[in-house]
């Protein structure tokens, strides 16, 4: 806290300009009005005050607006949004798309901090949806923002904000939002051609089901090892070995370093051992030539 | 401000259906947030039974889904539940509400005893 | 389904005391987690939302922490007006579910 001390002849400010980078804290305490500087916040960002005289600015604010500052101020605090606690955040009531994106660039580059974190739930929230111009807006900032939404947010992401995507955005997705995902990105993309098409899925196909992954397999797309093991278990293990050498091309010996691991190890132990060893990779733990091969699920989906 | 206000019967038959009303003031439905029906029973264990969305989509608990059914009237601002052949376990004080991210409006709720 | 599992089911503590709740779920919800409070014969109110967010109203004493499937909600120096039965609830995915309740009561 800094003392109340009278303002020293000549020294009140009649203006937010740069001569107050000259001020020492008690100075700008007793000479600065709370309310000139909230009608002026836009010029702060452009005035190289020091940590120190920031706090003191900010204290002032917190005096002026004890229930939280209006939005006017909010959309100019530039860099004073850096000295902002989640407390003080939470008290704020941001409503206008323009206002996050200017305190979202303030803080471009960085890991999303906690204040930003709790500014942007308090806007969605605030709003009671996650629309396309959000969404994007967030996505540009925080592009890994799409795998932080729960699977009922993503339900509503409308299928045009999915073309944005780039892979790494994904990369922390787990498999109930890709499965959420996987269909949005099926429609986004559905008149592109086949190369291209396979480019852009790709990432998403951890949500895709069976019968997809049939479907890109009779279209030579080569789909890597690391995209093949991220695929959702269940919808692997119904696809033959002819699908899968057809699905991974070349990429096909990659299997043998990954037979212990799943989905490879799950998809092997469903599969006849003379089908794996047309591979020629040696992969072991197949289905032994003779046995009688029962499907229990359309046993059970029969009964 | 918004308020949400249950309406229906206190009673209800077993093997009937119970229709329960929810009336939002101060922000129209179509606007943003989903509207939840929750309910409270006798000892009270809260169950989240549906919600509708703001854009008309709804989803329901997996253990009702067969005899629940929630839809909106957006002319009048309200959303509805109906709950078909009810049993004694389904005596409860029902709750509308809205959320996101967590309920942070709710009605008072209303009190329904299933007894012949 | 995720379960939700609150601990302890009941509690005494006296005023100005800290205490604190638990909840584990069954599986990860991120941070789509609620805390909520409800007086005898009223409706649920929200404390904390996104596992940590206190709701607009709710004073700073309260204190929601936690992520992934293990939560917590700490009430610091507890008023009067604190005691009731608190709830967590998740939002991750439907069908949302509640955790059984921990009533909190004066010494």
């Known amino acids: 806290e800094v003392e109340k001390t009278a303002c020293p002849s000549g020294k009140k400010a009649r203006e937010i300009d740069e001569s107050l980078i000259f001020y020492k804290k008690w100075e700008l305490e007793a000479c600065v009005d709370a309310a000139l500087l909230a009608t002026q916040m836009d010029r702060v960002n452009a005035i190289p005050f020091t940590y120190e005289q920031l706090d003191v600015l900010k204290h002032k604010l917190d005096e002026l607006y004890p229930q939280g500052y209006p939005e006017s101020v909010i959309q100019h605090l530039g860099y004073l949004f850096l000295k902002m606690s989640p407390e003080d955040i939470r008290k704020w009531n941001v409503t206008s798309l323009e206002t996050l994106k200017a305190l979202l660039e303030v803080n471009k580059g960085h890991e999303m901090s906690p204040q930003v974190a709790t500014l942007i739930d308090r806007f969605v929230k605030g709003r009671g949806q996650l629309d396309k111009d959000t969404l994007d807006t967030l996505t540009a900032f925080y592009p890994g923002y799409l795998c932080s939404l729960s699977p009922e947010e993503l339900s509503s992401v409308p299928p045009s904000s999915i073309w944005a995507v780039r892979p790494q955005d994904l990369d922390t997705c787990d498999p109930r939002q890709l499965d959420v995902l996987y269909p949005k990105a099926r429609l986004a993309f559905q008149n592109m051609n086949g190369s291209e098409y396979f480019v852009k899925i790709q990432s998403f196909l951890g949500g895709a089901p069976t019968e997809d992954l049939k479907a890109l397999s009779q279209q030579n797309v080569s789909m890597d090892l690391a995209t093949f093991m991220k695929l959702r278990t269940d919808a692997v293990l119904p696809l033959t070995v002819a699908e899968v050498q057809k699905l991974l091309g070349p990429h096909v010996e990659g299997l043998k370093a990954e037979e212990r691991h799943r989905p490879v190890r799950d998809w092997i132990l469903r599969q006849r051992q003379d089908d794996l060893d047309t591979l020629g990779l040696g992969l072991q733990g197949g289905i032994p030539n003779g046995y009688l091969v029962l499907d229990l699920s359309m046993q059970e989906a029969l009964s | 401000d918004v308020q949400l206000q249950e309406s229906g019967p206190g009673l209800v038959k077993p093997s009937q259906s119970l229709s329960l009303t929810c009336s939002v003031t101060?922000?129209?439905?179509?606007?943003?947030?989903?509207w939840n029906w929750i309910r409270q029973f006798p000892g009270n264990k809260l169950e989240w039974m549906a919600y509708i969305r703001y854009d008309g989509s709804n989803n329901y608990n997996p253990s009702l889904k067969n005899r629940i059914s929630i839809i909106r009237d957006t002319s009048k601002n309200q959303f509805f539940l109906r709950l078909n052949s009810v049993t004694t376990e389904d005596t409860a004080t029902y709750y509308c509400?809205?959320?996101?991210?967590?309920?942070?409006?709710w009605g008072q709720g209303i009190s329904v005893t299933v007894s012949s | 389904d995720i379960q939700m599992t609150q601990s302890p089911a009941s509690l005494s503590a006296s005023v100005g005391e800290t205490v604190t709740i638990t909840c584990r779920t069954s599986?990860?919800?991120?941070?789509?987690l609620a805390w909520y409070q409800q007086k005898q014969g009223k409706s649920p109110q929200l404390l904390v939302y996104k596992a940590k967010t206190l709701e607009n109203g709710v004073p700073s004493r309260f204190t929601g922490s936690g992520s992934g499937t293990q939560f917590s909600l700490k009430i610091d120096s507890l008023q009067p007006e604190d005691f009731g039965t608190y709830y967590c609830?998740?939002?991750?995915?439907?069908?949302?579910?509640f955790g059984g309740g921990t009533k909190l009561e004066i010494k």
């Open positions: 609830q998740h939002f991750w995915t439907t069908p949302y579910t």
């Open positions: 509400a809205k959320s996101y991210y967590g309920m942070d409006d």
């Open positions: 599986g990860d919800i991120h941070n789509y």
């Open positions: 101060g922000y129209s439905i179509t606007s943003g947030y989903y």
